[in-house]
Amino acid sequence: LQDPCSKCPAGTFCDNNRNQICSPCPPNSFSSTSGQKACDICRQCEGVFRTKKVCSSTSNAECDCTPGFHCLGAGCSMCEQDCKQGQELTKKGCKDCCFGTFNDQKRGICRPWTNCSLDGKSVLVNGTKERDVVCGPSPADLSPGASSVTPPAPAREPGHSPQ
C-alpha cells in the first residue's frame, strides 16, 4: 500500500491533524523533499552571519559571514574573526607575528620562516611578518665577492616551533 504522505511535494508537509492532507509549510519553515511529516525551521542568519540565500518553502536559508569574518564548518556553521596578513588571532585579538615568523593569510597562525641553511642554501630575500624568506643558491654557488643576506631566522626543523 502506498503511503498517502508520499504524494506531498517539497514545500508541503503531510498534516496528520487534517487526514494527511498536504499542507503548505508555515512561514519561516521549509521541506526540501516529498513526503515529509513536518517542515523544518529555516536557519536564521544573525549576529556575525549574514544571509547569502533566503529561505523558501522548498530550501533552507544559506548564510555566510559578515565582512571581517571567515566561514568554518559545513554550510558556514561558524564564523571566525579575520586578522591582517602578518598577524594571528588570539583571545585578546589580532597580534603581530613574532620576529622570525610569518602569516600570509587573513586567518590561521604564524609559522617560522624557512631556515635556508638546512637545505644548504642561502637567504635571497629576507622574510617579513607577511612573507616567508626566499632561499637562493647555496653560499658555495655564489660568485666570489657576492654576499648573501643571512638574517637570524629561527630553526625550522620538522617538529620544532618558534618559542
Partner: antibody, heavy 116, light 109 residues
Framework: QVQLVQSGAEVKKPGESLKISCKGS????????ISWVRQMPGKGLEWMGK????????NYSPSFQGQVTISADKSISTAYLQWSSLKASDTAMYYC?????????WGQGTLVTVSS | DIELTQPPSVSVAPGQTARISCSGD??????AHWYQQKPGQAPVVVIY???NRPSGIPERFSGSNSGNTATLTISGTQAEDEADYYC???????????FGGGTKLTVLG
C-alpha cells in the same frame, strides 16, 4: 563540499612500518592546517601534531615527537601519518581534522591494529 | 603544556541541566572549544571560542570560560545528548592543541 577521506583500516605486526593518508577536497588544501588526533580503544582524544600543507611545516605534541612523522603532498591534497616501527600500544583510531584550534571537519578515522 | 581536567562522568535526568567542567591553569586566557562524540562517529564541535554555538547545534548548548575553568552547559537535556564531551584549547606557548580527558554524559531513564 569539504571532505577529508582517510585510508582504510590496517592490521600490522609490531616492528612493521605504516603510512596512513587523509585526502582533502572541496577547499584550498594548501592553506589550512591539518591535525592528527589519536583515540585509543575506550579512551579519549589526543592531539598528535599538525602540518601546514602549503610548505609542509610541522609541529608535534611533546608526547608524539619522535614517535611519528607527519607529512603532506599538496599536489594531491593529501596529508600522511607514518610510523617506522609500530608497537602494540599504537593500536587506536586515528583521525585527521582540518584546523589547529577549532577542528571544523574530520575524516572518518583509520583504525590501526598492531598485534603479533 | 597546559593540562585540562574533566570529570569522567556526569549523569542527568531528562529535562534537567547538565554542566561539564574543564579545568586548567588560566584556561580563561585561551579560547576553549567543546566537541561531542557519539559511539562510532567522529567528534563534532558544539561550542567554539568559549561560548559560540555553530548553526545546527541546539540552543540548549552553551559555554563559558574564565579563570581556571571552562564550562559546557546543556539546559533541558535530551536523550540524544548522551555522548562523550571533550574540551580543548590551543596554546600559543607550545603551539599545541590539548584535549581534556573527556566526560561521558549519561541521560537517566
Amino acid at each position: 563540499q569539504v571532505q577529508l577521506v582517510q585510508s582504510g583500516a590496517e592490521v600490522k605486526k609490531p616492528g612493521e612500518s605504516l603510512k596512513i593518508s587523509c585526502k582533502g577536497s572541496g577547499y584550498s588544501f594548501s592553506t589550512y592546517w591539518i591535525s592528527w588526533v589519536r583515540q585509543m580503544p575506550g579512551k579519549g582524544l589526543e592531539w598528535m601534531g599538525k602540518i601546514y600543507p602549503g610548505d609542509s611545516y610541522t609541529n608535534y605534541s611533546p608526547s608524539f615527537q619522535g614517535q611519528v612523522t607527519i607529512s603532506a603532498d599538496k599536489s594531491i591534497s593529501t596529508a600522511y601519518l607514518q610510523w617506522s616501527s609500530l608497537k602494540a600500544s599504537d593500536t587506536a583510531m586515528y583521525y585527521c581534522a582540518r584546523g589547529y584550534g577549532i577542528f571544523d571537519y574530520w575524516g572518518q578515522g583509520t583504525l590501526v591494529t598492531v598485534s603479533s | 603544556d597546559i593540562e585540562l581536567t574533566q570529570p569522567p562522568s556526569v549523569s542527568v535526568a531528562p529535562g534537567q541541566t547538565a554542566r561539564i567542567s574543564c579545568s586548567g591553569d588560566n584556561i580563561g586566557d585561551q579560547y576553549a572549544h567543546w566537541y561531542q562524540q557519539k559511539p562510532g562517529q567522529a567528534p563534532v564541535v558544539v561550542i567554539y571560542q568559549d561560548k559560540n554555538r555553530p548553526s545546527g547545534i541546539p540552543e540548549r548548548f552553551s559555554g563559558s570560560n574564565s579563570g581556571n575553568t571552562a564550562t559546557l552547559t546543556i539546559s533541558g537535556t535530551q536523550a540524544e545528548d548522551e555522548a562523550d564531551y571533550y574540551c580543548s584549547t590551543y596554546t600559543f606557548v607550545g603551539f599545541t592543541t590539548v584535549f581534556g580527558g573527556g566526560t561521558k554524559l549519561t541521560v537517566l531513564g
